[in-house]
């Protein structure tokens, strides 16, 4: 799995979308989990409704919400009031029994508010990151930015 980078501004909301094949994953609940370490399991943050037919209902855990468009095949995760501690590596998962298939690996980046939290010399400008030369970057901020395709370093 390549990793998609989603960038949001601290204090604002960030929406992460995970597209999937609606027929292949028919009847399956979904989950959003976080990779805390280089190794070890992905720790569940929030999952869709226990009744698959009610997956469209938004479920919250703290400031993180999940909702699933099972017909359109799009899982949407909302991180409200984004904070630096939200930055990290996540996965969208499709659940079946005790197993979980990875739908998408997501790197969440929390950008400091350029007006409040950075030195003038540290202002962030859209562009390609050195570490992720060809990664796919989705900018969930209030202006449209350039996108580029990038491969993610291998993860365990």
């Amino acid at each position: 799995h390549n990793t998609t980078v989603f960038q949001g501004v601290a204090g604002q909301s960030l929406q992460v979308s995970c597209p999937y094949d609606s027929m292949k994953h028919w009847g399956r609940r979904k989950a959003w989990c976080r990779q805390l370490g280089e190794k070890g399991p992905c720790q569940r943050v929030v999952s869709t409704h226990n009744l698959w037919l009610l997956s469209f209902l938004r479920r919250w855990n703290g400031s993180t919400a999940i909702t699933d468009d099972t017909l359109g095949g799009t899982l949407t995760i909302t991180l409200r009031n984004l904070q630096p501690h939200d930055a990290g590596l996540y996965q969208c998962q499709s659940l079946h029994g005790s197993e979980a298939d990875t739908l998408r690996k997501v790197l969440v980046e929390v950008l400091a508010d350029p007006l409040d939290h950075r030195d003038a010399g540290d202002l962030w400008f859209p562009g390609e990151s050195e570490s992720f030369e060809d990664a796919h970057v989705e900018h969930s901020i209030s202006r449209s930015l350039l996108e580029g395709e990038i491969p993610f370093p291998p993860t365990s």
Partner: antibody, heavy 122, light 107 residues
Framework: QVQLVESGGGVVQPGRSLRLSCAAS????????MHWVRQAPGKGLEWVAV????????YYADSVKGRFTISRDNSKNTLYLQMNSLRAEDTAVYYC???????????????WGQGTLVTVSS | DIQMTQSPSTLSASVGDRVTITCRAS??????LAWYQQKPGKAPKLLIY???SLESGVPSRFSGSGSGTEFTLTISSLQPDDFATYYC?????????FGGGTKVEIK
């Protein structure tokens, strides 16, 4: 195992500059956010700054904003803190610490280096 | 900034005692709290993260609880190695502030 070793501390006059370094080993340095934390003699802990895994995103404590700059060189597995316009109140042991979460930025600190003492005095 | 208030500032206890340290946040921080132990001349060491998760390698006599604004660190049976200063830290804002510390000393 994970090791963080700070260097560059010493005695410096008010208004002068100093650059601290933190050499990292035992983990994938380029995959973790890194922090600087300080502790004035006999006092508590104060977070100073954090930098993201790739150096593109930085946050600072209000007390050092505009004077200190955090940076990193992933090819050298080294974290830096450039301290300008130093004041007597910047006197402290400076610790570097690894963010506790893979590709994280604002989480718990684990582990910490042994610290380097910066004394600002005329 | 979110203010963290730790109490007591000093605590005298004996080996085998059950010890509880409290940390209060000036506003809700959910479970975004960590606890550290620091011995004189040494760097702090992580004990607890996300309010109640025990760091790998930390003895099970340490436990953390609480959410929102009230948190506690409990040492179920104090050992000689536990005499140290303990700090809480909130991680719910741009500036991750620490409590003032609690020194656990021998009674």
């Amino acid at each position: 195992q994970v090791q963080l070793v700070e260097s560059g501390g010493g005695v410096v006059q008010p208004g002068r500059s100093l650059r601290l370094s933190c050499a990292a080993s035992g983990f994938t340095f380029s995959s973790y956010g890194m922090h600087w934390v300080r502790q004035a003699p006999g006092k508590g802990l104060e977070w100073v700054a954090v930098i993201s895994y790739d150096g593109s995103n930085k946050y600072y404590a209000d007390s050092v904003k505009g004077r200190f700059t955090i940076s990193r060189d992933n090819s050298k597995n080294t974290l830096y803190l450039q301290m300008n316009s130093l004041r007597a109140e910047d006197t402290a042991v400076y610790y570097c610490a690894k963010d506790g979460v893979y590709y994280g930025l604002g989480n718990w600190f684990d582990p910490w280096g042994q610290g380097t003492l910066v004394t600002v005095s005329s | 900034d979110i203010q963290m208030t730790q109490s007591p500032s000093t605590l005298s206890a004996s080996v085998g005692d059950r010890v509880t340290i409290t940390c209060r946040a000036s506003q809700s921080i959910s479970s975004w709290l960590a606890w550290y132990q620091q011995k004189p001349g040494k760097a702090p060491k992580l004990l607890i993260y996300k309010a109640s998760s025990l760091e790998s390698g930390v003895p099970s006599r340490f436990s953390g609880s609480g959410s929102g604004t009230e948190f506690t660190l409990t040492i179920s049976s104090l050992q000689p190695d536990d005499f140290a200063t303990y700090y809480c830290q909130q991680l719910n804002s741009y500036s991750p502030t620490f409590g003032g510390g609690t020194k656990v000393e021998i009674k």
